[in-house]
Interface confidence: medium
């Protein structure tokens, strides 16, 4: 029987800068029941606080609700593992909520083949930002990537759309069925997961771009 091994805070994520969750990996348990507690303080403070919510994020997590989340302050946090034989501490992790935002995927991806009379045909797609993200406040700049591939192809073709919520693609293989997905990323944060695939059939008379 031994004191617990050193835990590790391995991930912190926020869906929208208003709340966030951190997760830790336990170390070895030393063969005894082990209790874990996460403590934190904010930049410029020395007063330590305990995790406000160990439930919402699931096992080995700490969730910070709206009233505990400050956007402009760095959080300094640590996990303490304790059993009857002693304690061990994780390394401290510094968390700035601005940097850990991982939004939900964009919504309402629609894809259409456009065949204007006077120009070459193209694939046109548009989407909406995730609902949890409020772009009107100016706190967020969301960047978008699109990827697409013929249904049976192995490789994706990826395009960067910047801040646009619509995009055109000219060079496509006629007669092929394409999968299209979009994802988003705040300027300082993480890419979202890809949206569910939208399928589009390219007509056989689609003229390839020269």
């Amino acid at each position: 029987q031994l004191p617990p091994g050193k835990p590790e805070i391995f991930k912190c994520r926020s869906p929208n800068k208003e709340t966030f969750t951190c997760w830790w990996r336990p170390g070895t348990d030393g063969g005894l029941p082990t209790n874990y507690s996460l403590t934190y303080h904010r930049e410029g403070e020395t007063l330590m606080h305990e995790c406000p919510d160990y439930i919402t994020g699931g096992p080995n997590s700490c969730h910070f609700g709206k009233q505990y989340t400050s956007m402009w302050r760095t959080y300094v946090m640590m996990v303490n593992a304790t059993n009857q034989m002693g304690s061990s501490f994780s390394d401290e992790l510094y968390v700035d909520v601005t940097y850990i935002v991982q939004p939900d995927p964009p919504l309402e991806l629609t894809v259409e083949v456009k065949q204007p009379e006077d120009r070459k045909p193209y694939l046109w797609m548009k989407w909406s930002p995730p609902t949890l993200i409020d772009l009107k406040t100016g706190w967020f700049t969301l960047l978008y990537e699109i990827r697409l591939k013929p249904e049976k192809a192995a490789e994706w073709e990826t395009h960067f759309a910047g801040q646009q919520t619509e995009f055109k693609i000219l060079s496509l293989h006629p007669g092929q069925k394409y999968l299209v997905q979009v994802r988003c990323k705040p300027d300082h944060g993480y890419w979202s997961a890809w949206s569910p695939a939208t399928f589009i059939q390219i007509p056989s008379d689609f003229i390839m771009n020269d």
Partner: antibody
Amino acid sequence: EVQLLESGGGLVQPGGTLRLSCAASGFTFSAYAMSWVRQAPGKGLEWVSSINVRAGDTYYADSVKGRFTISRDNSKNTLFLLMNSLRAEDTAAYYCAKARYSSNWGFDFWGQGTLVTVSS
Amino acid sequence: DIVMTQSPDSLTVSLGARTTINCQSSQTILHSSNNHNYLAWYQQKPGLPPKLLIYWSSTRESGVPDRFSGSGSGTDFTLTISSLQAEDVAIYYCQQYSNTPYTFGQGTKLEIN
């Protein structure tokens, strides 16, 4: 106002011992990691050692491991560096540096330095 | 150990000019847990201790003029002075605090012509 005042430097022969001190004021000393960084004359900066709030957490550069010991006395707001088996290549200005938090990163305040000269 | 390499070693620039100093780490210092780059920039003037300018690769220390900015991620970082002033003559160092031993770049000496 944060102040860090190093002392204890001087001339010492190779193989000798010195104990550097750093008196801290203007902040809650016990809440922050502290480090020693040195600079040989005309050269760049070299991290030497750090100590976290939990005094058992100490870290050393390979070049000083086994010869230097960092410690702190939170009741006296003082950081120490005990330097044994000194070599000519240890000659440098030794700076005491405060980290932002209780473990180590970005040294936000530095002392003026104390000069250690190892020579026969 | 993580090796930090700065370029150039020295730089002579006109007053008011935009100035950039580069720093490359031998391995990534971006931590996936918090999306932070564990990199700092310091300024050292002759006869004085270093002064922290930038931490987390891009966060300006309080009191540092806003002509100083940091950028980059992973292994490649840049310190930019948007309009060089006479008081910016100094040696500039980058430092990684991702892993011990914490290591510094060799320094970039900035002078005015």
